[in-house]
Amino acid sequence: MAVTACQGLGFVVSLIGIAGIIAATCMDQWSTQDLYNNPVTAVFNYQGLWRSCVRESSGFTECRGYFTLLGLPAMLQAVRALMIVGIVLGAIGLLVSIFALKCIRIGSMEDSAKANMTLTSGIMFIVSGLCAIAGVSVFANMLVTNFWMSTANMYTGMGGMVQTVQTRYTFGAALFVGWVAGGLTLIGGVMMCIACRGLAPEETNYKAVSYHASGHSVAYKPGGFKASTGFGSNTKNKKIYDGGARTEDEVQSYPSKHDYV
Protein backbone atom coordinates (compact mmCIF):
# COMPACT_ATOMS: atom_id res chain seq x y z
CA MET A 1 0.00 0.00 0.00
CA ALA A 2 2.77 2.45 1.05
CA VAL A 3 4.83 1.28 -1.93
CA THR A 4 1.95 1.99 -4.34
CA ALA A 5 1.43 5.42 -2.80
CA CYS A 6 5.15 6.25 -2.98
CA GLN A 7 5.33 5.08 -6.58
CA GLY A 8 2.19 6.93 -7.60
CA LEU A 9 3.24 10.10 -5.83
CA GLY A 10 6.70 9.89 -7.38
CA PHE A 11 5.10 9.55 -10.80
CA VAL A 12 2.80 12.56 -10.27
CA VAL A 13 5.60 14.74 -8.85
CA SER A 14 7.87 13.80 -11.77
CA LEU A 15 5.07 14.47 -14.25
CA ILE A 16 4.58 17.98 -12.83
CA GLY A 17 8.36 18.49 -12.83
CA ILE A 18 8.80 17.46 -16.44
CA ALA A 19 5.87 19.63 -17.51
CA GLY A 20 7.66 22.49 -15.73
CA ILE A 21 10.96 21.73 -17.47
CA ILE A 22 9.18 21.79 -20.84
CA ALA A 23 7.46 25.06 -19.91
CA ALA A 24 10.73 26.64 -18.75
CA THR A 25 12.53 25.56 -21.93
CA CYS A 26 9.84 27.14 -24.09
CA MET A 27 9.50 30.34 -22.05
CA ASP A 28 10.90 33.61 -23.39
CA GLN A 29 11.72 35.10 -20.01
CA TRP A 30 15.03 33.47 -19.13
CA SER A 31 16.64 36.86 -18.76
CA THR A 32 14.75 40.10 -18.35
CA GLN A 33 15.85 43.70 -18.50
CA ASP A 34 16.85 44.93 -15.07
CA LEU A 35 14.28 47.47 -13.90
CA TYR A 36 15.92 48.32 -10.59
CA ASN A 37 14.67 51.70 -9.32
CA ASN A 38 12.98 53.05 -12.47
CA PRO A 39 12.56 51.79 -15.99
CA VAL A 40 15.20 53.81 -17.81
CA THR A 41 13.83 52.93 -21.22
CA ALA A 42 10.29 52.84 -22.54
CA VAL A 43 10.78 49.35 -23.90
CA PHE A 44 11.22 46.11 -21.97
CA ASN A 45 13.67 43.55 -23.31
CA TYR A 46 13.62 39.89 -22.37
CA GLN A 47 15.29 36.82 -23.80
CA GLY A 48 14.76 33.09 -23.88
CA LEU A 49 16.72 30.13 -25.21
CA TRP A 50 15.16 30.42 -28.64
CA ARG A 51 14.30 34.07 -29.20
CA SER A 52 14.53 37.57 -27.78
CA CYS A 53 11.54 39.82 -27.30
CA VAL A 54 10.83 43.51 -26.90
CA ARG A 55 7.67 44.80 -25.29
CA GLU A 56 6.80 48.42 -25.83
CA SER A 57 4.90 50.30 -23.18
CA SER A 58 1.76 50.14 -25.32
CA GLY A 59 1.83 46.38 -24.84
CA PHE A 60 3.01 45.72 -28.38
CA THR A 61 5.44 42.80 -28.26
CA GLU A 62 7.81 41.71 -30.98
CA CYS A 63 9.94 38.57 -30.78
CA ARG A 64 12.82 37.54 -32.99
CA GLY A 65 14.20 34.01 -33.18
CA TYR A 66 17.91 33.30 -33.01
CA PHE A 67 18.14 32.22 -36.62
CA THR A 68 21.85 31.56 -36.36
CA LEU A 69 23.29 28.42 -34.80
CA LEU A 70 27.00 29.00 -35.10
CA GLY A 71 26.73 32.61 -33.99
CA LEU A 72 25.22 31.74 -30.62
CA PRO A 73 27.33 31.60 -27.45
CA ALA A 74 28.55 28.11 -26.55
CA MET A 75 27.03 28.47 -23.09
CA LEU A 76 23.58 29.11 -24.56
CA GLN A 77 23.97 26.05 -26.76
CA ALA A 78 25.00 24.02 -23.71
CA VAL A 79 21.94 25.20 -21.78
CA ARG A 80 19.69 24.28 -24.70
CA ALA A 81 21.31 20.83 -24.85
CA LEU A 82 20.93 20.24 -21.12
CA MET A 83 17.26 21.22 -21.16
CA ILE A 84 16.49 19.06 -24.19
CA VAL A 85 18.31 16.07 -22.70
CA GLY A 86 16.33 16.64 -19.50
CA ILE A 87 13.04 16.70 -21.40
CA VAL A 88 13.89 13.59 -23.47
CA LEU A 89 15.02 11.59 -20.44
CA GLY A 90 12.01 12.76 -18.48
CA ALA A 91 9.62 11.81 -21.26
CA ILE A 92 11.15 8.34 -21.58
CA GLY A 93 11.08 8.03 -17.81
CA LEU A 94 7.38 8.88 -17.76
CA LEU A 95 6.66 6.30 -20.43
CA VAL A 96 8.56 3.62 -18.55
CA SER A 97 7.02 4.55 -15.21
CA ILE A 98 3.47 4.30 -16.58
CA PHE A 99 4.04 0.60 -17.28
CA ALA A 100 5.83 0.20 -13.96
CA LEU A 101 2.94 1.51 -11.87
CA LYS A 102 1.70 -1.13 -9.45
CA CYS A 103 -1.90 -0.11 -9.96
CA ILE A 104 -1.75 -0.69 -13.72
CA ARG A 105 -1.87 -4.27 -14.96
CA ILE A 106 -0.35 -5.22 -18.28
CA GLY A 107 -0.08 -8.79 -19.53
CA SER A 108 1.69 -11.16 -17.17
CA MET A 109 4.37 -8.75 -16.03
CA GLU A 110 6.31 -9.96 -13.02
CA ASP A 111 6.80 -7.69 -10.04
CA SER A 112 10.54 -7.98 -10.56
CA ALA A 113 10.08 -6.41 -14.00
CA LYS A 114 7.96 -3.66 -12.50
CA ALA A 115 10.61 -3.06 -9.87
CA ASN A 116 13.32 -2.78 -12.53
CA MET A 117 11.18 -0.42 -14.60
CA THR A 118 10.46 1.70 -11.54
CA LEU A 119 14.17 1.93 -10.77
CA THR A 120 14.97 2.78 -14.41
CA SER A 121 12.35 5.53 -14.53
CA GLY A 122 13.51 6.83 -11.15
CA ILE A 123 17.09 7.12 -12.37
CA MET A 124 15.87 8.81 -15.55
CA PHE A 125 13.89 11.32 -13.52
CA ILE A 126 16.88 12.05 -11.29
CA VAL A 127 19.16 12.63 -14.30
CA SER A 128 16.41 14.69 -16.01
CA GLY A 129 16.02 16.88 -12.94
CA LEU A 130 19.77 17.31 -12.61
CA CYS A 131 20.03 18.30 -16.29
CA ALA A 132 17.35 20.96 -15.83
CA ILE A 133 18.91 22.30 -12.63
CA ALA A 134 22.33 22.33 -14.28
CA GLY A 135 21.01 24.08 -17.39
CA VAL A 136 19.22 26.77 -15.43
CA SER A 137 22.19 27.24 -13.11
CA VAL A 138 24.63 27.62 -16.01
CA PHE A 139 22.36 30.27 -17.53
CA ALA A 140 21.98 32.03 -14.18
CA ASN A 141 25.75 32.06 -13.73
CA MET A 142 26.09 33.53 -17.22
CA LEU A 143 23.65 36.28 -16.28
CA VAL A 144 25.38 37.09 -13.01
CA THR A 145 28.75 37.32 -14.76
CA ASN A 146 27.33 39.60 -17.45
CA PHE A 147 25.41 41.68 -14.94
CA TRP A 148 28.45 42.54 -12.89
CA MET A 149 30.53 43.14 -15.96
CA SER A 150 27.74 45.55 -16.97
CA THR A 151 27.61 43.83 -20.34
CA ALA A 152 25.07 45.67 -22.41
CA ASN A 153 23.62 42.63 -24.09
CA MET A 154 24.15 39.02 -23.17
CA TYR A 155 24.26 37.99 -26.80
CA THR A 156 26.53 40.76 -28.01
CA GLY A 157 27.61 40.12 -31.56
CA MET A 158 24.97 37.45 -31.99
CA GLY A 159 23.45 37.47 -35.42
CA GLY A 160 25.21 40.69 -36.34
CA MET A 161 23.69 42.65 -33.48
CA VAL A 162 25.58 45.83 -32.67
CA GLN A 163 26.17 46.84 -29.07
CA THR A 164 24.35 50.04 -28.41
CA VAL A 165 22.40 50.34 -25.21
CA GLN A 166 23.61 49.74 -21.66
CA THR A 167 20.94 47.17 -20.90
CA ARG A 168 21.52 44.94 -17.90
CA TYR A 169 19.71 41.63 -17.64
CA THR A 170 18.56 39.83 -14.54
CA PHE A 171 16.90 36.49 -13.72
CA GLY A 172 13.68 35.84 -15.61
CA ALA A 173 10.69 33.79 -14.50
CA ALA A 174 11.85 30.79 -16.54
CA LEU A 175 14.86 30.32 -14.27
CA PHE A 176 12.69 29.91 -11.20
CA VAL A 177 10.27 27.64 -13.06
CA GLY A 178 13.26 25.57 -14.20
CA TRP A 179 14.79 25.28 -10.75
CA VAL A 180 11.50 24.26 -9.13
CA ALA A 181 10.64 21.87 -11.97
CA GLY A 182 14.09 20.29 -11.88
CA GLY A 183 13.80 19.87 -8.14
CA LEU A 184 10.37 18.26 -8.42
CA THR A 185 11.59 15.85 -11.11
CA LEU A 186 14.55 14.96 -8.91
CA ILE A 187 12.31 14.35 -5.88
CA GLY A 188 9.95 12.29 -8.02
CA GLY A 189 12.88 10.20 -9.22
CA VAL A 190 14.06 9.57 -5.68
CA MET A 191 10.53 8.52 -4.70
CA MET A 192 10.43 6.07 -7.61
CA CYS A 193 13.76 4.58 -6.51
CA ILE A 194 12.45 4.20 -2.97
CA ALA A 195 9.27 2.58 -4.29
CA CYS A 196 11.40 0.16 -6.31
CA ARG A 197 12.87 -1.32 -3.15
CA GLY A 198 9.39 -2.09 -1.85
CA LEU A 199 8.35 -3.61 -5.16
CA ALA A 200 11.26 -6.05 -5.40
CA PRO A 201 9.91 -9.57 -4.73
CA GLU A 202 11.14 -11.41 -1.66
CA GLU A 203 12.31 -14.87 -2.81
CA THR A 204 11.28 -16.65 0.42
CA ASN A 205 10.97 -20.42 0.00
CA TYR A 206 8.52 -22.13 2.31
CA LYS A 207 9.31 -25.67 3.40
CA ALA A 208 6.92 -28.39 2.27
CA VAL A 209 4.23 -28.95 4.82
CA SER A 210 1.82 -31.89 4.77
CA TYR A 211 -1.67 -31.40 6.00
CA HIS A 212 -3.67 -34.48 6.86
CA ALA A 213 -7.35 -33.95 6.40
CA SER A 214 -9.94 -36.71 6.76
CA GLY A 215 -8.20 -39.70 5.32
CA HIS A 216 -6.29 -38.34 2.33
CA SER A 217 -3.44 -35.93 2.22
CA VAL A 218 -2.87 -32.83 0.20
CA ALA A 219 0.58 -31.28 0.12
CA TYR A 220 1.80 -27.88 -0.98
CA LYS A 221 4.80 -27.98 -3.25
CA PRO A 222 7.92 -26.25 -2.01
CA GLY A 223 8.67 -22.89 -3.59
CA GLY A 224 5.93 -20.98 -1.92
CA PHE A 225 4.29 -17.92 -3.37
CA LYS A 226 5.92 -15.21 -5.34
CA ALA A 227 4.45 -11.78 -4.87
CA SER A 228 1.52 -12.03 -7.20
CA THR A 229 0.76 -9.70 -10.03
CA GLY A 230 -2.90 -10.60 -9.66
CA PHE A 231 -3.36 -11.47 -13.28
CA GLY A 232 -2.22 -13.97 -15.87
CA SER A 233 -2.47 -17.76 -16.02
CA ASN A 234 -1.64 -18.55 -12.41
CA THR A 235 -2.91 -21.84 -11.05
CA LYS A 236 -5.40 -20.91 -8.39
CA ASN A 237 -4.49 -22.15 -4.95
CA LYS A 238 -7.64 -23.51 -3.43
CA LYS A 239 -8.33 -22.90 0.19
CA ILE A 240 -8.01 -26.32 1.80
CA TYR A 241 -7.31 -25.63 5.39
CA ASP A 242 -8.27 -22.39 7.04
CA GLY A 243 -5.61 -21.37 9.52
CA GLY A 244 -6.14 -17.76 8.48
CA ALA A 245 -4.33 -18.15 5.14
CA ARG A 246 -6.16 -16.55 2.18
CA THR A 247 -5.90 -17.53 -1.44
CA GLU A 248 -4.35 -15.38 -4.13
CA ASP A 249 -7.85 -14.75 -5.34
CA GLU A 250 -8.86 -13.13 -2.14
CA VAL A 251 -5.69 -11.14 -1.71
CA GLN A 252 -4.96 -9.76 -5.14
CA SER A 253 -7.72 -10.23 -7.66
CA TYR A 254 -9.75 -7.22 -6.67
CA PRO A 255 -7.71 -4.16 -5.90
CA SER A 256 -8.87 -2.13 -2.94
CA LYS A 257 -9.47 1.59 -3.14
CA HIS A 258 -6.14 2.10 -1.40
CA ASP A 259 -4.24 0.71 -4.37
CA TYR A 260 -4.96 3.84 -6.41
CA VAL A 261 -3.29 7.19 -5.80
Epitope: T41, A42, V43, N45, V54, S57, G59, A152, V162, V165
Partner: antibody
Protein backbone atom coordinates in the same frame (compact mmCIF):
# COMPACT_ATOMS: atom_id res chain seq x y z
CA UNK B 1 -12.70 57.66 -35.08
CA UNK B 2 -10.23 58.45 -32.29
CA UNK B 3 -10.69 61.88 -30.73
CA UNK B 4 -9.18 63.73 -27.79
CA UNK B 5 -11.09 66.85 -26.77
CA UNK B 6 -9.50 69.18 -24.27
CA UNK B 7 -11.12 71.70 -21.94
CA UNK B 8 -11.12 75.43 -22.70
CA UNK B 9 -8.49 78.07 -22.00
CA UNK B 10 -7.69 78.95 -18.39
CA UNK B 11 -6.61 82.23 -16.83
CA UNK B 12 -5.31 81.66 -13.31
CA UNK B 13 -3.57 83.57 -10.53
CA UNK B 14 0.00 82.74 -9.48
CA UNK B 15 0.11 80.14 -6.70
CA UNK B 16 -3.27 78.73 -7.67
CA UNK B 17 -4.01 75.31 -9.15
CA UNK B 18 -5.78 74.29 -12.33
CA UNK B 19 -7.19 71.03 -13.62
CA UNK B 20 -7.15 70.33 -17.34
CA UNK B 21 -9.35 67.63 -18.84
CA UNK B 22 -9.01 65.49 -21.93
CA UNK B 23 -12.12 63.59 -23.01
CA UNK B 24 -11.38 60.68 -25.28
CA UNK B 25 -13.58 58.71 -27.66
CA UNK B 26 -13.30 56.17 -30.47
CA UNK B 27 -11.05 53.67 -28.70
CA UNK B 28 -10.75 51.64 -25.50
CA UNK B 29 -9.63 54.27 -23.00
CA UNK B 30 -8.11 51.81 -20.51
CA UNK B 31 -5.82 50.19 -23.09
CA UNK B 32 -3.68 53.15 -24.12
CA UNK B 33 -1.27 55.49 -22.39
CA UNK B 34 -2.20 59.16 -22.22
CA UNK B 35 0.72 61.59 -22.43
CA UNK B 36 0.78 65.29 -21.60
CA UNK B 37 3.03 67.73 -23.46
CA UNK B 38 3.77 71.39 -22.71
CA UNK B 39 4.46 74.00 -25.39
CA UNK B 40 5.39 77.50 -24.38
CA UNK B 41 4.51 80.27 -26.79
CA UNK B 42 6.64 80.06 -29.93
CA UNK B 43 8.82 77.41 -28.34
CA UNK B 44 9.44 73.68 -28.51
CA UNK B 45 7.68 70.74 -26.93
CA UNK B 46 8.30 69.40 -23.44
CA UNK B 47 7.11 66.01 -22.23
CA UNK B 48 5.38 66.20 -18.84
CA UNK B 49 4.50 62.59 -18.21
CA UNK B 50 2.16 59.77 -19.06
CA UNK B 51 -0.70 57.94 -17.40
CA UNK B 52 -2.13 54.46 -17.97
CA UNK B 53 -5.87 54.51 -17.19
CA UNK B 54 -6.03 50.71 -17.07
CA UNK B 55 -3.89 50.50 -13.94
CA UNK B 56 -3.56 54.08 -12.76
CA UNK B 57 0.21 54.01 -13.34
CA UNK B 58 1.91 57.34 -13.94
CA UNK B 59 5.43 58.31 -15.02
CA UNK B 60 6.60 61.90 -14.71
CA UNK B 61 9.38 63.96 -16.13
CA UNK B 62 11.43 64.92 -13.06
CA UNK B 63 11.03 68.58 -14.00
CA UNK B 64 7.27 68.25 -13.44
CA UNK B 65 7.34 66.05 -10.34
CA UNK B 66 5.21 67.83 -7.73
CA UNK B 67 3.97 70.29 -10.33
CA UNK B 68 1.73 67.99 -12.39
CA UNK B 69 -0.58 65.22 -11.17
CA UNK B 70 -2.06 62.86 -13.75
CA UNK B 71 -5.33 61.04 -13.12
CA UNK B 72 -8.27 59.65 -15.08
CA UNK B 73 -11.95 58.86 -14.76
CA UNK B 74 -12.57 55.56 -16.48
CA UNK B 75 -16.35 55.89 -16.44
CA UNK B 76 -16.23 59.00 -18.63
CA UNK B 77 -13.01 58.07 -20.52
CA UNK B 78 -11.48 61.34 -19.42
CA UNK B 79 -7.88 62.04 -18.44
CA UNK B 80 -6.94 64.90 -16.14
CA UNK B 81 -3.84 66.86 -15.36
CA UNK B 82 -3.72 69.07 -12.29
CA UNK B 83 -1.09 71.78 -12.20
CA UNK B 84 -0.32 73.25 -8.79
CA UNK B 85 1.55 76.28 -7.39
CA UNK B 86 1.35 77.99 -10.74
CA UNK B 87 3.99 80.49 -11.78
CA UNK B 88 4.32 82.68 -14.85
CA UNK B 89 6.56 80.15 -16.60
CA UNK B 90 3.73 77.62 -16.40
CA UNK B 91 1.90 79.73 -18.97
CA UNK B 92 1.75 77.50 -22.04
CA UNK B 93 -0.43 75.35 -24.25
CA UNK B 94 -0.86 71.85 -22.79
CA UNK B 95 -1.61 68.92 -25.09
CA UNK B 96 -2.96 65.54 -24.15
CA UNK B 97 -1.94 62.77 -26.53
CA UNK B 98 -2.48 59.06 -26.96
CA UNK B 99 0.42 56.65 -27.30
CA UNK B 100 -0.12 54.43 -30.32
CA UNK B 101 -0.01 50.64 -30.25
CA UNK B 102 2.98 49.15 -32.06
CA UNK B 103 4.29 52.58 -33.03
CA UNK B 104 7.46 52.68 -31.02
CA UNK B 105 5.92 54.64 -28.13
CA UNK B 106 5.02 57.46 -30.52
CA UNK B 107 1.98 59.67 -29.90
CA UNK B 108 -0.46 59.11 -32.74
CA UNK B 109 -3.41 61.27 -31.69
CA UNK B 110 -3.31 64.70 -30.09
CA UNK B 111 -5.88 66.92 -28.43
CA UNK B 112 -6.31 70.46 -29.71
CA UNK B 113 -4.49 71.87 -26.68
CA UNK B 114 -5.52 73.93 -23.66
CA UNK B 115 -4.00 77.36 -23.16
CA UNK B 116 -3.12 78.21 -19.57
CA UNK B 117 -2.20 81.79 -18.72
CA UNK B 118 -0.81 82.55 -15.28
CA UNK B 119 -1.24 86.21 -14.51
CA UNK B 120 -2.03 88.38 -11.53
CA UNK C 1 18.23 63.54 -19.93
CA UNK C 2 18.80 62.76 -23.59
CA UNK C 3 19.51 65.89 -25.59
CA UNK C 4 18.00 66.04 -29.07
CA UNK C 5 19.68 68.52 -31.40
CA UNK C 6 17.96 69.54 -34.63
CA UNK C 7 19.53 71.42 -37.51
CA UNK C 8 19.02 73.76 -39.14
CA UNK C 9 16.65 75.69 -36.88
CA UNK C 10 14.94 77.12 -39.95
CA UNK C 11 15.04 76.46 -43.65
CA UNK C 12 13.58 78.32 -46.62
CA UNK C 13 12.96 76.30 -49.77
CA UNK C 14 11.05 76.48 -53.00
CA UNK C 15 8.25 74.05 -53.84
CA UNK C 16 9.42 70.91 -55.60
CA UNK C 17 12.81 71.10 -53.92
CA UNK C 18 14.30 68.21 -51.92
CA UNK C 19 14.99 69.01 -48.28
CA UNK C 20 16.84 67.16 -45.53
CA UNK C 21 16.32 67.85 -41.83
CA UNK C 22 18.83 66.54 -39.31
CA UNK C 23 18.37 65.27 -35.76
CA UNK C 24 21.11 64.06 -33.43
CA UNK C 25 20.64 62.43 -30.03
CA UNK C 26 23.15 62.45 -27.18
CA UNK C 27 22.74 58.68 -26.79
CA UNK C 28 21.94 55.87 -29.17
CA UNK C 29 18.23 55.26 -29.64
CA UNK C 30 18.79 51.81 -31.14
CA UNK C 31 17.36 48.96 -29.11
CA UNK C 32 19.50 45.87 -29.66
CA UNK C 33 16.61 43.53 -28.85
CA UNK C 34 14.65 44.32 -32.00
CA UNK C 35 17.14 46.45 -33.94
CA UNK C 36 14.71 49.37 -33.96
CA UNK C 37 15.49 53.02 -33.43
CA UNK C 38 13.05 54.71 -31.09
CA UNK C 39 12.97 58.07 -32.80
CA UNK C 40 9.79 59.83 -33.92
CA UNK C 41 9.19 62.76 -36.24
CA UNK C 42 6.23 65.15 -35.83
CA UNK C 43 4.94 67.93 -38.02
CA UNK C 44 3.28 70.96 -36.41
CA UNK C 45 1.47 73.43 -38.57
CA UNK C 46 0.74 76.91 -37.23
CA UNK C 47 -2.02 76.98 -34.61
CA UNK C 48 -2.45 73.19 -34.67
CA UNK C 49 -1.29 70.31 -32.49
CA UNK C 50 1.65 68.24 -33.76
CA UNK C 51 0.92 65.29 -36.06
CA UNK C 52 2.77 61.99 -36.17
CA UNK C 53 4.81 61.58 -39.35
CA UNK C 54 7.41 58.86 -38.77
CA UNK C 55 8.03 56.38 -35.97
CA UNK C 56 10.80 53.80 -35.43
CA UNK C 57 12.96 56.34 -37.30
CA UNK C 58 11.78 55.17 -40.71
CA UNK C 59 8.19 53.83 -40.54
CA UNK C 60 5.70 56.21 -42.11
CA UNK C 61 2.42 56.72 -40.27
CA UNK C 62 -0.64 55.78 -42.31
CA UNK C 63 -1.94 58.69 -44.35
CA UNK C 64 1.44 60.43 -44.48
CA UNK C 65 2.53 61.20 -48.07
CA UNK C 66 5.41 59.08 -49.33
CA UNK C 67 7.49 62.16 -50.05
CA UNK C 68 8.38 62.05 -46.33
CA UNK C 69 11.16 59.58 -45.58
CA UNK C 70 12.90 58.91 -42.28
CA UNK C 71 16.34 57.37 -42.05
CA UNK C 72 19.33 56.98 -39.78
CA UNK C 73 20.34 54.82 -36.86
CA UNK C 74 21.89 55.12 -33.44
CA UNK C 75 22.41 58.82 -32.85
CA UNK C 76 22.09 60.40 -36.31
CA UNK C 77 18.73 60.70 -38.04
CA UNK C 78 17.32 62.55 -41.01
CA UNK C 79 13.89 63.44 -42.32
CA UNK C 80 13.83 63.89 -46.07
CA UNK C 81 11.06 65.61 -48.00
CA UNK C 82 11.65 64.58 -51.61
CA UNK C 83 9.57 67.30 -53.21
CA UNK C 84 8.39 70.06 -50.90
CA UNK C 85 4.76 71.17 -51.28
CA UNK C 86 3.16 74.37 -50.02
CA UNK C 87 1.24 72.43 -47.35
CA UNK C 88 4.54 71.20 -45.87
CA UNK C 89 5.11 74.63 -44.32
CA UNK C 90 5.46 73.68 -40.64
CA UNK C 91 7.82 73.08 -37.74
CA UNK C 92 9.28 69.55 -37.63
CA UNK C 93 10.22 67.99 -34.32
CA UNK C 94 12.17 64.83 -33.63
CA UNK C 95 11.56 63.00 -30.37
CA UNK C 96 13.45 60.46 -28.29
CA UNK C 97 10.91 57.72 -27.64
CA UNK C 98 13.34 55.42 -25.90
CA UNK C 99 14.69 56.93 -22.72
CA UNK C 100 12.71 58.54 -19.94
CA UNK C 101 11.96 61.35 -19.91
CA UNK C 102 10.95 61.52 -23.56
CA UNK C 103 12.63 64.57 -25.06
CA UNK C 104 12.01 66.65 -28.16
CA UNK C 105 14.42 68.46 -30.42
CA UNK C 106 14.18 72.23 -30.70
CA UNK C 107 12.43 71.90 -34.04
CA UNK C 108 13.20 72.88 -37.63
CA UNK C 109 10.97 75.51 -39.18
CA UNK C 110 10.38 74.84 -42.85
CA UNK C 111 9.43 77.94 -44.81
CA UNK C 112 8.40 78.20 -48.44
CA UNK C 113 9.71 80.98 -50.68
Amino acid sequence: QVQLKQSGAELVRPGASVSLSCKTSGYIFTSYWIHWVKQRSGQGLEWIGRFYPGTGTAYYNENFEGKATLTADRSSSTAYMQLSSLKSDDSAVYFCTREGYGKGNAMDYWGQGTSVTVSS
Amino acid sequence: DIVMTQSPSSLTVTTGEKVTLSCKSSQSLLNSGNQKNYLTWYQQKSGQPPELLIYWASTRESGVPDRFTGSGSGTDFTLTVSSVQAEDLAVYYCQNDYYFPFTFGGGTKLEIK
